[in-house]
């Protein structure tokens, strides 16, 4: 039985032009993480593979940086980056766990610093 749970930063906001860290954490399972996919609407942003390391999708290379840890840093944010992001953990032997983060990119400088993973 799959016992694990994914904790995420939940709903977060950031300023246009700024950066944000997307972070998920898998807990309550002894399963081994074999790969983490970071996805946005059926599009792959990046992969962190336990054996092969990081792969950033070519279309995001300029604006996405690996880490910290299994997280993902989005840079030079635009309003178009607003939306849902998914961390998909491939684990052995449990299978797949999915976490969801909603990012809102704000035009103004009143972006709430609601997430502890926010980069100032």
């Amino acid at each position: 039985m799959m016992t694990g749970t994914i904790e995420t930063t939940g709903n977060i906001s950031a300023e246009k032009g700024g950066s944000i860290i997307l972070q998920c954490h898998l807990s309550s399972t002894t399963a081994q993480v074999t790969q983490v996919n970071w996805e946005q609407q059926d599009q792959l942003l990046a992969i962190c593979n336990a054996d092969l390391g990081w792969h950033i999708s070519p279309s995001f290379k300029d604006r996405v940086a690996p880490g910290p840890g299994l997280g993902l840093t989005l840079q030079s944010l635009t309003v178009n980056d607003t939306g849902e992001y998914f961390c998909i953990y491939h684990t052995y032997p449990d299978g797949t766990y999915t976490g969801r983060i909603f990012l809102e990119v704000l035009e103004s400088s009143v972006a709430e610093h609601g997430a502890r993973f926010q980069i100032p």
Epitope: H55, S57, Y92, P93
Partner: antibody
């Protein structure tokens, strides 16, 4: 909905080649792995190999090395398998299937492509 | 290559019954075994992976167990739509191999 749509049936001559396609939809294609599986008429399933969709790395069953070639086109989320030097033994249904990176179980399958080799 | 042996090519059961299908690996595959259902004219469908993990959306009347070399797939309260061929597969090492299949017939 996660789907793998395969190309239609093929009737080919002995010694010819065939290229089968598998178009993915409903998920981030490059984050997963596409496997190819052979099922001869009324028989069991045989794993041909797999391709890593984001970098094109391949892993072939020794029994199919030199016979099968896998490629991907990430722009169209499509995987391809080319089968060369066809003989009657290659007449079968060929499936593409998706997997995670370990454990390697196949969670989504295409409908299959029937290849008939005739002399 | 690891050989997966399903000793029964055919099994007959009745609606409402319980049926168990066995699969034996030629060497230790830990718990790296999946079970698939293939209905007539259809592609295989994943039911169980890692020996005992039920795939998303699969009814809980389907269960899997075993480790090492001996594995069992059980259907409780068999339904008419369970008429199919069931395959085990080892996902322990390449080349990944399948059992010969067990055809479940409904009396």
């Amino acid at each position: 909905e996660v789907q793998l749509q395969q190309s239609g049936p093929e009737l080919v001559k002995t010694g010819a080649s065939v290229k089968i396609s598998c178009k993915a939809s409903g998920y981030a294609f490059t984050g997963y792995y596409i496997h190819w599986v052979k099922q001869s008429h009324g028989k069991s399933l045989e794993w041909i190999g797999h391709i890593t969709c984001y970098n094109g790395a391949t892993n072939y069953n020794q029994n199919f090395k030199g016979k099968a070639t896998f490629t991907v086109d990430t722009s169209s989320s499509t995987a391809y398998m080319q089968f060369n030097s066809l003989t009657s033994e290659d007449s079968a249904v060929y499936y593409c299937a998706r997997s995670n990176y370990r454990p390697w179980y196949f969670d989504v399958w295409g409908a299959g492509t029937t290849v008939t080799v005739s002399s | 290559d690891i050989v997966m042996t399903q000793s029964h090519k055919f099994m007959s059961t009745s609606v409402g019954d319980r049926v168990s299908i066995t699969c034996k690996a030629s060497q230790d595959v830990s718990t790296d075994v999946a079970w698939y259902q293939q209905r007539p004219g259809q592609s295989p469908k994943l039911l169980i992976y890692s020996a005992s993990y039920r795939y998303t959306g699969v009814p809980d009347r389907f269960t899997g167990s075993g480790s090492g070399t001996d594995f069992t797939f059980t259907i409780n309260n068999v339904q008419a739509e369970d008429l199919a061929v069931y395959y085990c597969q080892q996902h322990y090492s390449t080349p990944y191999t399948f059992g010969g299949g067990t055809k479940l017939e409904i009396k």
